[in-house]
């Protein structure tokens, strides 16, 4: 069809902010889960820890969160898991300082990716128990498709 | 041309990870060599350590190095080099410990410019023999065309 | 009308690098006021310390800011206000080394946010007199209408 | 306290070659990089280069490329500029400064009292 | 290379008066401006950095301001101390260029 100037711009966007982030007890890592701030488009669904792949194609993906921690080196890992395997997208570290008072840093990456029909896509911070700031404008994650 | 849903949405886009990096002996800068991870469109060239702008337009681009290095700031400069002149597009500067064990992070930033045909953006460390991670999840380049 | 491949990718874009920053004596905050280094479209108005939305819709929003102060911790809140409102969008945060020597961060964030019109985009410092490097590219603002 | 303390007024013959030494003291030589800066007599500030003791590296000023040489011994706290093909718009007298080690950014904060170098056939 | 464009290049002023010396910058500089005083035969000595920013040190008649391609430097009250040449300087991009330099003389 014809495209009208409205429809022409309307990339598939997703926003998503916490809900909460917990420790496997099994595990050195955090999870965040999360829920949709801003959503246009329907090729994107938050799946608890998750956000599955509805839509196949390349994605702008961009991640914060915000440590307030004093281990020596905080961060997050953004993978995707699908057809049996997992891959490490991008990855943001900051190191922490040791005092408590000081030790308050946000880490954002972002990167473009081909994501699959399927894939499910994580922020992992490879630490258990890591002390979050789970503020909506201090951790979040998006997706804008291209 | 009437444009399909399908060539609505083809922005150009070149997500780059490192090959390898260099210092040259008279001048005080680390050099990244990147190779694409991921292409669509032919507007962008990996051309040694830089990329090759052969589609002129207005472009985001973004850029991550993962530093391990002790020296008290690190960071890296996007530059384009085109007509006979150099420009630096952006920055990116953090200040790491001074203890081995703990100086580790990545530095992201990005921002929207107009390139020019024929230009050439290169990521340029400004400190010799940086100490950099490699990894492709911690040090990337990436554009697309808006 | 039918959309020309020209026309398809016109995304509105707007880069914006400082004039200056200042602190009212009676406020715990430092504003930059920005002036374009880049505009496509004509939906973005640069206003002294805010930047005017008049065409409303998704933008993906990025700021930065270079930091040059020993303050334990400095950031920037990047908000719209309209209707009658405020709201933070997202906020950046960088501890700061306590030597001056190496008290040295850029400060980069970005999202992407529904945006209304009349409303007014500012990037606050929530600190007094802050010492920010106003280079233009270490400290910038950044849309891109999606 | 910061002390840069350069060597003493040379006399060349165009063609030939100058070494000027720098020696630091009060502060960690390897966190800062040495700056040259030039003054013909009567005339401006012109920026030379810099190395950075950190990792005895270089950055110089296009101008001076090919003619320039800077280089640092860290054990002596000391940087040098050695400069060649030596012309008698060389003439002038040659500063060390000190600069913090991200060099952009950063003034120059100390500076050595100034080398008088004079070519002349 | 950016050219640090100073006026005027000499100023006649005496003890007492308020003097503002302008540098201008071919391109924006942001804040990557530092003045210097020099006085015959002597190196230069950094009086502001930033642009605004005094030296330690240095007396507070002394201001610079200025961000973009415009910079002062401003004497608030001259003493007799403050008669030299004070020059500018861009350190935003390499090559660090200097203004031409502006003499103050006592009038």
């Known amino acids: 069809a014809v495209l009208t100037q409205k429809q022409k711009k309307q990339h598939s966007v997703l926003h998503l902010v916490p809900i909460n982030a917990t420790s496997k007890d099994d595990s050195d890592v955090t999870e965040v889960m999360w829920q949709p701030a801003l959503r246009r488009g329907r090729g994107l669904q938050a799946q608890g820890y998750g956000v599955r792949i509805q839509d196949a194609g390349v994605y702008l993906l961009y991640s914060q969160v915000l440590f307030q921690d004093v281990t020596f080196t905080m961060g997050q890992v953004v993978s995707r898991e699908g057809q049996g395997r997992q891959e490490t997208l991008f990855r943001c570290i900051r190191s922490m300082p040791s005092h408590p008072d000081r030790a308050y840093n946000s880490c954002y990456s972002a990167g473009v990716f081909h994501l699959h029909q399927g894939d499910i896509l994580s922020v992992i911070i490879p630490r258990a128990r890591a002390k979050l700031n789970l503020s909506p404008h201090g951790t979040f994650l998006g997706f804008v498709k291209l | 041309a009437v444009l399909t849903q399908k060539q609505k949405k083809q922005h150009s886009v070149l997500h780059l990870v490192p090959i390898n990096a260099t210092s040259k002996d008279d001048s005080d800068v680390t050099e990244v060599m990147w190779q694409p991870a991921l292409r669509r469109g032919r507007g962008l060239q990996a051309q040694g350590y830089g990329v090759r702008i052969q589609d002129a337009g207005v472009y985001l681009l973004y850029s991550q190095v993962l530093f391990q290095d002790v020296t008290f700031t690190m960071g890296q400069v996007v530059s384009r080099e085109g007509q006979g002149r150099q420009e630096t597009l952006f920055r990116c500067i953090r200040s790491m410990p001074s203890h081995p064990d703990r100086a580790y992070n990545s530095c992201y930033s990005a921002g929207v410019f107009h390139l020019h045909q024929g230009d050439i953006l290169s990521v340029i460390i400004p400190r010799a023999r940086a100490k950099l991670n490699l990894s492709p999840h911690g040090t990337f380049l990436g554009f697309v065309k808006l | 009308a039918v959309l020309t491949q020209k026309q398809k990718k016109q995304h509105s874009v707007l880069h914006l690098v400082p004039i200056n920053a200042t602190s009212k004596d009676d406020s715990d905050v430092t504003e930059v006021m920005w002036q374009p280094a880049l505009r496509r479209g004509r939906g973005l108005q640069a206003q002294g310390y805010g930047v005017r939305i008049q065409d409303a819709g998704v933008y993906l929003l990025y700021s930065q800011v270079l930091f040059q102060d020993v303050t334990f911790t400095m950031g920037q809140v990047v908000s719209r206000e309209g209707q009658g409102r405020q709201e933070t969008l997202f906020r950046c945060i960088r501890s700061m080394p306590s030597h001056p020597d190496r008290a040295y961060n850029s400060c980069y964030s970005a999202g992407v946010f529904h945006l209304h019109q009349g409303d007014i985009l500012s990037v606050i410092i929530p600190r007094a007199r802050a010492k920010l490097n106003l280079s233009p590219h270490g400290t910038f603002l950044g849309f891109v209408k999606l | 306290q910061v002390q840069l303390v350069q060597s003493g007024a040379e006399v060349k013959k165009p063609g030939a070659s100058v070494k000027v030494s720098c020696k630091a003291s009060g502060y960690t030589f390897t966190s800062y990089v040495m700056h040259w800066v030039r003054q013909a007599p009567g005339q401006g500030l012109e920026w030379m280069g810099y190395?950075?003791?950190?990792?005895?590296?270089?950055k110089y000023n296009e101008k001076f490329k090919g003619r320039v040489t800077m280089t640092s011994d860290t054990s002596a706290s000391t940087a040098y500029m050695e400069l060649s093909s030596l012309r008698s718009d060389d003439t002038a007298v040659y500063y060390c400064?000190?600069?913090?080690?991200?060099?952009?950014?950063?003034?120059?904060?100390?500076w050595g009292q100034g080398t008088t170098v004079t070519v002349s056939s | 290379d950016i050219v640090m464009t100073q006026s005027p290049s000499t100023l006649s002023a005496s003890v007492g008066d308020r003097v503002t010396i302008t540098c201008k910058a071919s391109?924006?500089?942001?804040?990557?401006v530092a003045w210097y005083q020099q006085k015959p035969g002597k190196a230069p000595k950094l009086l502001i950095s930033s642009a605004s920013n005094r030296d330690s040190g240095v007396p507070s008649r002394f201001s610079g301001s200025g961000s973009g391609t415009e910079f002062t430097l401003t004497i608030s009250s001259l003493q007799p101390d403050d008669f030299a040449t004070y020059f500018c300087q861009q350190y935003n991009i390499y090559p660090f260029t200097f203004g031409q330099g502006t003499k103050l003389e006592i009038k």
């Open positions: 391109q924006n500089v942001g804040n990557n």
């Open positions: 190395i950075n003791p950190y990792n005895d590296a270089p």
């Open positions: 400064a000190r600069g913090l080690g991200y060099a952009l950014y950063y003034a120059m904060d100390y």
